[in-house]
Interface confidence: low
């Protein structure tokens, strides 16, 4: 049986291929025949789906070139948020101690995460679920598991998010050392093996492989919200918005913002990833009387997709008595 | 933006040493790139003499092979050639490139000239 | 050793009109994944090499879309749609299927 191949390395030119190249082994033990190329989807990392991208005025935004994206305090249009109770806006609340830690760990999660989005070559997950320890090149790499406040993360269960071992698929390679992996998703982590098969493959098997982790560049328009965005009226002064989430989005869809407005359109609203698989779209609260626009846009791992075409709705002022002890 | 710089003495005397190196600015030579040399003798076409990666493997002109050696430093960011026992024959301008894989050489130097002179 | 073969080696052109210069390997350059590993260079005069084409048909960051490349297995083509006269300058095909990498002896073009 040959030894590893040596060097294994990978690079992306699209949204759905992946190119590997690789060295042949150092001890071929023989005539080196070919090579199996097996490659496996990896699931994105759990904290992912869990956070709250729409906690603490936290958005990420697309800030370089290369699609790494980075969480950053909004000052302008800060949304709200509830202190205690439904009372409308308030100041933000003091910080606990337990908040200022889980802020500092964030930052220090947001420079690993943002290593991650920048290698091809993938780092390990700072966080796993179900495996303590991983085994990489014959190297036991512990990780530390983060606390995080519950303001910023969701117990829902995301069916994705279910860390499904992704069949692996696999091709042969003949007479040389890279190949072209096809047909794959945008902005997605790929595990990819390679081994060595020499004259006696049949009889005795291959080596043992040699991997390596990649991801495919984002898909222009992959975060796109597909479809026209509806909307249903409610009590209270309020509307319900609904939309279709992107189809094959590049990694995952973290959040969405509706910009919204009876003039123009300066009210901004942030719905987590976590409120939209639950209601299916979001609810827009005291509204004045009137007619209003919205439009709506996803934001996932590699950036923001496009804003939808605005949708018009209106809400009716109160008749009668009622509207005039209003 | 990636950029290699080449330098080197521009001339060499017969039976001694080409030494080249290629200054890698605006990224990293610790990416997922294989760094090429390739040389264009006097009004002739171009020649590749090899490539290594930043781990240090390396592929060779079998031709050249016997004395060809490149390694690279990643602590200064560069990568270098030396080409042993020199006649005219290896008189050229030296490229280094940026092999990116399956995408082709997109980045190259501006060429060095190395001239085998006594 | 995989050997590339480049015709014409001298190609005249004129401004506005097309221009073909034909690449020759002497194995298949084509893989079992469907991709040929084939590259075009272009070097005008007195400047470094550039990439126009790679996996024979696919054009490289910001190169015009008058250029482009064809073929498959052991035949390929680069066609420049409508020859500019910043286009001069020699043209070389290179095979990446297996090291050694080797280039084609390259096609001069100039303007008539």
């Known amino acids: 049986v040959p030894s590893i191949p040596l060097d294994v390395l990978s690079a992306s030119n699209s949204s759905s291929q992946l190119i590997v190249k690789w060295n042949p082994p150092s001890l071929p033990n023989g005539n080196l025949s070919y090579y199996i190329v097996r490659w496996q989807r990896q699931p994105q990392d759990g904290y992912l789906y869990r956070h709250n991208y729409c906690s603490k005025d936290k958005i990420p935004i697309r800030k370089y070139a290369d699609g790494t994206i980075d969480i950053e305090e909004v000052t302008e249009n800060p949304k709200t948020e509830v202190c205690g109770g439904e009372k409308g806006p308030c100041c933000a609340c003091p910080k606990t101690e337990a908040e200022k830690q889980a802020e500092k760990e964030e930052a220090e999660y947001r420079k690993v995460f943002e290593n991650f989005l920048h290698n091809s070559i993938f780092v390990p997950r700072p966080e796993r679920k179900r495996r303590d320890v991983m085994q990489v090149a014959n190297t036991t790499m512990s990780s530390r598991s983060r606390n995080t406040t519950a303001a910023d993360t969701y117990n829902i269960t995301d069916p994705e998010e279910l860390e499904t071992e992704y069949p692996f698929f696999e091709s042969r390679v003949d007479n040389k050392e890279r190949t072209v992996i096809s047909n794959l998703r945008p902005f997605t982590l790929y595990r990819i093996d390679i081994h060595s098969c020499n004259h006696e493959a049949e009889k005795l098997g291959c080596s043992a492989s040699n991997f390596v982790f990649a991801r495919t560049m984002p898909a222009e328009g992959a975060d796109d919200i597909p479809g026209p965005v509806t909307w249903e009226p409610r009590p209270e002064n309020s509307i319900f918005l609904k939309w279709p989430e992107p189809e094959n989005p590049n990694g995952l869809i973290l959040m969405y913002e509706i910009k919204y407005g009876s003039q123009v359109e300066d009210q901004r609203e942030c719905v987590s990833r976590q409120e939209y698989r639950k209601y299916g779209g979001a609810k827009l609260n005291r509204l004045n009387p009137g007619n209003y626009t919205a439009r709506i846009q996803a934001t996932s791992l590699s950036g923001n997709g496009s804003w939808t075409d605005p949708v018009f709705f209106y809400v009716q002022a109160k008749t009668g008595y009622e509207n005039f002890i209003h | 933006e990636v950029q290699l710089v080449e330098s080197g003495p521009g001339l060499v005397k017969p039976s001694g040493t080409l030494s080249l190196t290629c200054a890698v600015s605006?990224?990293?030579?610790?990416?997922?790139?294989?760094w090429s040399w390739v040389r264009q003798p006097p009004g002739k076409g171009l020649e590749w003499i090899g490539e290594i990666y930043h781990s240090g493997s390396t592929n060779y002109n079998p031709s050249l092979k016997s004395r060809v050696t490149i390694s690279v430093d990643k602590s200064k960011n560069q990568f270098s050639l030396k080409l042993s026992s020199v006649t005219a024959a290896d008189t050229a301008v030296y490229y280094c490139a940026r092999d990116y894989d399956i995408f082709g050489m997109d980045v190259w130097g501006q060429g060095t000239t190395v001239t085998v002179s006594s | 050793d995989v050997v590339m073969t480049q015709s014409p080696l001298s190609l005249p052109v004129t401004p506005g009109e097309p221009a073909s210069i034909s690449c020759r390997s002497s194995?298949?350059?084509?893989?079992?994944?469907?991709?040929?590993?084939l590259d075009w260079y272009l070097q005008k005069p007195g400047q470094s090499p550039q990439l126009l084409i790679y996996l024979g048909s696919n054009r490289a960051s910001g190169v015009p879309d008058r250029f482009s490349g064809s073929g498959s297995g052991t035949d390929f083509t680069l066609k420049i749609s409508r020859v500019e006269a910043e286009d001069v300058g020699v043209y070389y095909c290179?095979?990446?299927?297996?090291?050694?990498?080797?280039f084609g002896q390259g096609t001069k073009v100039e303007i008539k």
């Open positions: 194995q298949s350059l084509l893989h079992s994944n469907g991709y040929n590993y």
């Open positions: 290179m095979q990446a299927l297996q090291t050694p990498l080797a």
């Open positions: 605006g990224g990293s030579i610790s990416s997922s790139n294989w």
